[in-house]
């Protein structure tokens, strides 16, 4: 099955979700969706 | 603007394959995966699996195993799911879509306008 | 498999009252405190449409009227003044872990 990376860096700041998580290039794979950080 | 676009409808027997284009137009095709969604006549979603554009890599739902293919084209921006062995109670209508990451400041979903499979001797 | 349970099946209300619809899921679909857990619409003849994501997060373009509630295993979506176009079948979804599963959908319609 499929391999991938689904990293969810994030911090709360009052209680609203702010998400660090890196920019997603064509160079890294696939957005998978639905998901925090999940390229295929 | 984004486009999912699929084949047209089909009708199977018993036993046969049939497989199922989504060509995918509005965007870099690699850079989103490809899901698969069917809905038999008058029932509920069912998740079939995804494929990557980028790497070819596919996810499939275990119920599916050994039945369903998903592959890609990328010279074409096309996608291919190919579902074998085919019974009555896979006539349904064949969705594609992609998916932004719950991280992407946005979210939304795009579909295709769905491929009616019907399997009939 | 995490199965999704979705009730009621089907929910007549009039114009301009609320509507609520309730998923519970086998396990929790929470992860690092999000819970993967979506809202689609679909309307007769058109696929669906994602309306709430991460259980409480609006999906684009989508009117005020429609929120989503819940964390864990238990998820609420409400939609606060229901308007003739929001007639349609709404299931919950989960993206938590493969395979992605979908509740039996709600058939909301006006009274």
């Known amino acids: 099955d499929a391999e991938f990376r689904h990293d969810s860096g994030y911090e709360v700041h009052h209680q609203k979700l702010v998400f660090f998580a890196e920019d997603v290039g064509s160079n890294k794979g696939a957005i998978i969706g639905l998901m925090v950080g999940g390229v295929v | 603007q984004v486009q999912l676009v699929q084949s047209g409808a089909e009708v199977k027997k018993p036993g046969a394959s049939v497989k199922v284009s989504c060509k995918a137009s509005g965007y870099t095709f690699t850079t989103y995966a490809i899901h698969w969604v069917r809905q038999a006549p008058g029932q509920g979603l069912e998740w079939m699996g995804f494929?990557?554009?980028?790497?070819?890599?596919?996810n499939y739902n275990q119920k599916f195993k050994g039945r369903v293919t998903m592959t890609r084209d990328t010279s074409t921006s096309t996608v291919y799911m190919e579902l074998s062995s085919l019974r009555s109670e896979d006539t349904a209508v064949y969705y594609c879509?992609?998916?932004?990451?719950?991280?992407?400041?946005?979210?939304?979903?795009?579909w295709g306008q769905g491929t009616l499979v019907t399997v009939s001797s | 498999d995490i199965v999704m349970t979705q009730s009621p099946d089907s929910l007549a209300v009039s114009l301009g009252e609320r509507a609520t619809i309730n998923c519970r899921a086998s396990?929790?679909?929470?992860?690092?405190?999000?819970?993967?857990l979506n809202w689609y619409q679909q309307k007769p003849g058109q696929p669906p449409k994602l309306l709430i994501y991460a259980a409480t997060k609006q999906g684009t373009g989508v009117p005020d009227r429609f929120s989503g509630s819940g964390s864990g295993t238990d998820f609420t979506l409400t939609i606060s003044s229901l308007q003739a176009e929001d007639v349609a079948v709404y299931y919950c979804s989960q993206s938590k872990e493969f395979p992605w599963s979908f509740g039996g959908g709600t058939k909301v319609e006006i009274k």
């Open positions: 494929t990557s554009p980028y790497s070819g890599v596919s």
């Open positions: 879509a992609r998916f932004d990451n719950y991280d992407r400041g946005y979210v939304r979903d795009y």
């Open positions: 396990e929790s679909v929470d992860n690092d405190r999000i819970s993967f």
